[in-house]
Interface confidence: low
Amino acid sequence: TRDVREPPALKYGIVLDAGSSHTSMFIYKWPADKENDTGIVGQHSSCDVPGGGISSYADNPSGASQSLVGCLEQALQDVPKERHAGTPLYLGATAGMRLLNLTNPEASTSVLMAVTHTLTQYPFDFRGARILSGQEEGVFGWVTANYLLENFIKYGWVGRWFRPRKGTLGAMDLGGASTQITFETTSPAEDRASEVQLHLYGQHYRVYTHSFLCYGRDQVLQRLLASALQTHGFHPCWPRGFSTQVLLGDVYQSPCTMAQRPQNFNSSARVSLSGSSDPHLCRDLVSGLFSFSSCPFSRCSFNGVFQPPVAGNFVAFSAFFYTVDFLRTSMGLPVATLQQLEAAAVNVCNQTWAQLQARVPGQRARLADYCAGAMFVQQLLSRGYGFDERAFGGVIFQKKAADTAVGWALGYMLNLTNLIPADPPGLRKGTDFS
């Protein structure tokens, strides 16, 4: 006989990512004896909550909490029973709830209270439901991407930890209601609100981050819809042959479309709106979302927001990935350069509804919106953030890294459970139990 070393006990953590359009649950796991190592925490499982985001339940807070029950029941199965009590559970809400909190703080509080009430009924170590700031969302997304790609520290052949020379990756997140850009920068930020200083594994990082509220995919689509109603009476970004009834109350109920709201509109009126497959008018419509007129700093991205020049490589995830993946995979268009990305957007915007449906069979839900989405992504990256062809060459569009979804959730849990120490690791050798 010989001694067989048992694999170490695993620890688990759960994060509910309450986005504007939907909620996702992520369960993470890591070996209990390697808590301070990098690249050790990975995704164990995930679950998509049916229905809309929790902010869509402003009129029915208990409905928000009920929607989570199915995934929480799954968590009871996915996490071993003996680990339930020691498993931290967090809920973080992002821009959808930030918007609700702006327009209706009572409803936002009620939703969080209802959700909290439900989460405390479960045997996990519930550690709170809260709304993340845009800055937190950006920074935690950056931490996730760099942690998964082992850019902070790495375990070397000589049995010691070292900081890789390749530096960190910037992170770009396109959610439903906001978009975030975060990257390491050498110079101090002219706008202190955009700078975050982090100490991870004994290293100091100066990070620039900004979150643009109302620049998430869904809110952009609503704003373009409002603009189309206001200026054209047709939608240049929708395909010709596509027509739908638009309820004005839905278009103008978001704070993001408040500026375009007519003085005396009938919220219950339905307006028929048709597409015109016009890439040039669509580009103009999208351009209207960005303002470059004034900048109180030495340089800005758009809307008077300070941003240093983009530097280094970037990972673009969430709706950035879904948009580019649609162009690449569903439409078969090259998107390796900014020029190709623009050409791909124009290509989609030229398609009629019949052509689009024939080209992408079975994908009806958001098909009419891909032209606007692609045009927005292209303009946000080139005109908004200032990526030129060379810088764009360093952008990778990715959904997962190391079998784990890229997003703010993992970084949030790593931070709250102290799984990334501020101090450098000692000369400890890892043991592989695979």
């Epitope: 339940y57 402003a58 029915n60 009920q66 409803a107 009620s110 839905d250 109920q253």
Partner: antibody, heavy 125, light 106 residues
């Protein structure tokens, strides 16, 4: 036919508690939230709270927290509201109402589509 | 909480007359519902989401409005319309009702 059956009247002493019922029929009880509404004599309506029968999750108007407790018995498709520490201010008609809804552009819209006949609670010594 | 103010509190109308009841909100709401309550009975849904007629409601009833101002119109009042009318908002927690308008038929 969708119906919510409530019983006529309750006479209770100050400081006591009362539990009123609302029996649902004609639809799947667990598919809809049940709300409770108070109407004092000659006055308007006040929303008390709601309960989701499927998961036993309730939400309350702050003004009624500690005053009302909502429960359900799924087996008999009945919703209950217990009112405690009663005073003359609690004398009113209490209605249960089914919460109907429709979904448009990802937003849930709600309204009370069916009401019970109401239970009159009189608090008097 | 959002306060809904209905006016007038009491309205007297002749048969066949067109009348408008109003509901004003202390802050902007997305939409409102109207309920009708006849003497000694429970309320019934009349109009949902500002302008949609509930099942079985006669077409003489109509609703409109946005933001902080909403109205309910009866194009030709009939005797059976004598009732209390309440507006109700779901835009902000806690959900609130207006004080009601009592419609009397002359």
């Amino acid at each position: 036919e969708v119906q919510l059956q409530q019983f006529g009247a309750e006479l209770v002493k100050p400081g006591a508690s009362v539990k009123i019922s609302c029996k649902a029929s004609g639809y799947t009880f667990t598919d809809y939230n049940m709300d409770w509404v108070k109407q004092s004599h000659g006055k308007s309506l006040e929303w008390i709270g709601d309960i989701n029968p499927k998961y036993d999750i309730s939400t309350y108007n702050q003004q009624f927290k500690g005053k009302a407790t909502l429960t359900v018995d799924k087996s008999s498709s009945t919703a209950y509201m217990e009112l405690r520490s009663l005073t003359s201010e609690d004398t009113a008609v209490y209605y249960c109402a089914r919460r109907g809804f429709f979904l448009y552009y990802g937003i849930n819209y709600y309204y009370f589509d069916v009401w019970g006949a109401g239970t009159t609670v009189t608090v008097s010594s | 909480q959002i306060v809904l103010t209905q006016s007038p509190a009491i309205m007297s109308a002749s048969l066949g007359e067109e009348i408008t009841l109003t509901c004003s909100a202390s802050s902007s709401v997305s939409y409102i519902h109207w309920y009708q309550q006849k003497s000694g009975t429970s309320p019934t849904l009349l109009i949902y989401s500002t302008s949609n007629l509930a099942s079985g409601v006669p077409s003489r009833f109509s609703g409109s409005g946005s933001g902080t101002f909403y109205s309910l119109t009866i194009s030709s009042v009939e005797a059976e319309d004598a009732a209390d009318y309440y507006c109700h908002q779901w835009s902000s927690y806690p959900w609130t009702f207006g004080g009601g308008t009592k419609l009397e038929i002359k």
